[in-house]
Every structure is written in C-alpha cells, then in structure tokens.
C-alpha cells in the first residue's frame, strides 16, 4: 500500500506531514561528505501496536573522507522507487501530531543527515501545504493532499492552493477575504435555457464542463 507517486507539486509551496502513518519509510540519507555506516539501516520504518507507534531502526552517518570521495550517498535503484522529498523546515501548526493513533511523529534529526528527507508514504497519508516565504495563499482554506487508493491504483488528491507573489505592484494589497456570496440562484432569476452542450475529455477520471445561459430582463 505504498503510494506510487509523489504528493503534487504546487508552485511556490512546500508540503509537510504532521504525522506519518505506520508503514512509512524514511531513507537514511547523509549530507555531502558523509555516508551511511556499513552496518547501518537503509531506512527508518514507522511501526507500532494498538497503543503506540515509533520509528524502527536508526540512521547513522559517518565521514566518507577516508573513502576518498565527497559524494552524497544515493539510494540504489530499488530504493529510488516512491521517492518523496520534503525540505527540512519548522513544522506547520494546524494538526497536533502527538495524539494521532497509528502514526509516528517527525523523527528527530540524526548527525550529518542530508538537507532533504526522502519519505515513502503509504495510502491514507495526508500532507499539508503552505506557501514559501515571499508568497501568500490566494485562498485561506485548508491545503492538503491525501494518498488514496482507487480502482487498485494510488493517487494523491489535488490541493487547491494558489501561492501568489507578494509584489509591490499587486492589485490586492493586504486584501481581506471577501464575504462568501449566498449560494443558490437569486429569486428574481427566470431561467430561459438557450444552449447546453457537453465538453468532455476522456481521462482516468473524466471531468466535464458544460455551459448554459440564463436571461432575465433588466428593469
């Protein structure tokens, strides 16, 4: 039940998991000039029982200077499958990861670890997105993506986060979120259907957009 792909990439945004589902693997990567110790684990694994989850194995890096190389250790081809990269950053606030059953917390850093962590996520994992510094979210709603299994294939849901640059010339300086307009049709509307046709693209999950027209006389 490993997720086949990476979580979606959103321009000018990074994602972070607040907690990791049991079965998640984290590659033991070392920074440039260091390598895994010979007997060291290839990855850490989130495991647990009904009451407690924790990371099995420990990542350990040692100087590779004696090996006459400064190249970062790269995973073998079979390890590269399902690579999920998250930058090391301060965790985001929205979820309390301490009390989520069946999940592990963010593993503590190990000495000389690489600047990016490569996770192998499992079905049901949720990641949260936020705009990088210098960008703001156009919409203040939740921005998350979940790895789901549908028709025997895994896919990540698409987070609807738009990060727009904080430019001096922006048309929306310090803009407030507008009031949500009332849903449903205005009572005054009289619907006079003029045209309705389908526009459909066949994909794995077909999406259809159809447009039609309503007219009312303007008093």
């Amino acid at each position: 039940e490993l997720c086949d792909d990476d979580p979606p990439e959103i321009p000018h945004a990074t994602f972070k998991a607040m907690a990791y589902k049991e079965g998640t693997m984290l590659n033991c990567e070392c920074k440039r000039g260091f390598r895994r110790i010979k007997s060291g684990s290839l990855y850490m694994l989130c495991t647990g029982n009904s009451s407690h989850s924790s990371w099995d194995n420990q990542c350990q890096c040692t100087s590779s200077a004696t090996r006459n190389t400064t190249k970062q250790v790269t995973p073998q081809p079979e390890e590269q499958k399902e690579r999920k990269t998250t930058e090391m950053q301060s965790p985001m606030q929205p979820v309390d990861q301490a009390s989520l059953p069946g999940h592990c917390r963010e593993p503590p850093p190990w000495e000389n670890e690489a600047t990016e962590r490569i996770y192998h996520f499992v079905v049901g994992q949720m990641v949260y997105y936020q705009c990088v510094q210098g960008y703001r979210a156009l919409h203040r709603g939740p921005a998350e993506s979940v790895c789901k299994m549908t028709h025997g294939k895994t896919r990540w849901t698409q987070p609807q986060l738009i990060c727009t640059g904080e430019m001096e010339t922006s048309q929306f300086p310090g803009e407030e979120k507008p009031q949500a307009s009332p849903e449903g049709r205005p009572e005054s509307e009289t619907s006079c259907l003029v045209t309705t046709t389908d526009f459909q693209i066949q994909t794995e999950m077909a999406a259809t957009m159809e447009t039609s027209i309503f007219t009312t006389e303007y008093q």
Partner: antibody, heavy 104, light 110 residues
Framework: GESLKISCKGS????????IGWVRQMPGKGLEWMGL????????RYSPSFQGQVTISADKSISTAYLQWSSLKASDTAMYYC???????????WGQGTLVTVSS | QPVLTQPPSASGTPGQRVTISCSGG????????VYWYQQLPGTAPNLLIS???QRPSGVPDRFSGSRSDTSASLAISGLRSEDEADYYC???????????FGGGTKLTVL
C-alpha cells in the same frame, strides 16, 4: 441594458474543491482571464479589467458556477469559457463556451 | 493589449518544424510555469503543454515546450495539417494575481 446569467456545470470530479476560472474571447480576438471562484466557500477573485463589470458566483450543491451581468453592453459580445484550475495553476478542463451576443 | 507577446502568425509545410515564441516579464513567466493551449477552429482551448514542458496524456510528442528567464517557446515538429489552429501561451502573474495570456499565434500549414 438587459441582465444575463450564464452557467457552467462541472461533473466527474469534486466540484467544490477546485477553483473555476472564467475566460472571455471577443470575436476574432485572444483569451482574457476575467476572474475565478472557489465553489467550496464562494471565495472570488476578479481581474482588475472586469472588477465591477461582472459577478461570479457558484452553487456547490448543483456543481454550477455562474457569470452574471446586470446591464449588458454591445462590447460584452463574446464567447465565454469556464475552466477548471488544475495541477500547478493550469486551466486543465474547459467548457465548450457560451456565445453571448448583445445587439441593439 | 495582451501581457504576453506572441507573433500573430506562423506557418510551415507538412513535416517541417515550427517554433512559436512567447515573451513576458519578471512578474509572470519569470516566476511561474508557462502553459500552452491549442484552439482548433470553432472549439474551446485545449491544454497542450503544462508546467513549461510537460505534455498531458494524449498530446503527441511532436509538441514540446521550453522556458528561459522571461520567455517561452512552443515547438511543433513533423507539422501536420490538423495542427492548423490558434496557439496561446499563458501563465500566472504575481502582480495581477491572475492569469495572463499571449495574444495568440495563428498557425497555418501550407
């Protein structure tokens, strides 16, 4: 001078969780972005060129977005497209368009 | 005036390779992905190139995109008569907080 409301119905995906954009194409001309709406909570953004000229709304219960004029002008004659905002801010699925003709 | 600049027309003979350019600025192409849309006569635009160079499924590999600094280009190799259409570049503009389009390029297959 008349009012007009055109609609865009989405299906085959979670309508309320994807932004919908509206695009104008005047006869023989190019594409112009008008605005967008997040149907989940009707959060709306307009292009400065269209702010105050049109109203964008949505009814997520029937998976439909709307573009509305309170007083049409001859210069509003154009083809209007709705499109779903997909991966990386692409407009990935487009409606077939509604031709609005304003004649005096 | 469109924010992105495209040549109004381009042409080529079947089998040829043609390139369409798209020029922008630092608040749009300089900071965001470029998308290319194909609009066949009498139809709605269709996403042709995503994220500068990615082809959505179903788009032939004859179409390719690239981006450099504040400009982008669409290349069509092995030109075919069915490629005759209008092509638009588009991107998000951080100053506008919305999409901007090129004026469109009408491609004629001679």
């Amino acid at each position: 001078g008349e009012s007009l409301k055109i609609s865009c119905k989405g299906s085959g995906y979670s309508f309320s969780t994807y932004w919908i954009g509206w695009v104008r194409q005047m006869p023989g001309k190019g594409l112009e972005w008008m605005g967008l709406i997040y149907p989940g909570d009707s959060d709306t953004r307009y292009s400065p060129s269209f702010q105050g000229q049109v109203t964008i709304s949505a009814d997520k219960s029937i998976s439909t977005a709307y573009l509305q004029w309170s007083s049409l002008k001859a210069s509003d004659t154009a083809m209007y497209y709705c499109a779903r905002v997909g991966d990386g801010y692409s407009l990935d699925y487009w409606g077939q368009g509604t031709l609005v003709t304003v004649s005096s | 005036q469109p924010v992105l600049t495209q040549p109004p027309s381009a042409s080529g003979t079947p089998g040829q390779r043609v390139t369409i350019s798209c020029s922008g600025g630092s608040s749009n192409i300089g900071r965001n992905y470029v998308y290319w849309y194909q609009q066949l006569p009498g139809t709605a635009p269709n996403l042709l190139i995503s994220r500068n160079h990615q082809r959505p499924s179903g788009v032939p590999d004859r179409f390719s995109g690239s981006r450099s600094d504040t400009s982008a280009s669409l290349a069509i190799s092995g030109l075919r008569s069915e490629d005759e259409a209008d092509y638009y570049c588009a991107t998000w503009d951080d100053a506008l907080s919305g999409w901007v389009f090129g004026g469109g390029t009408k491609l004629t297959v001679l």
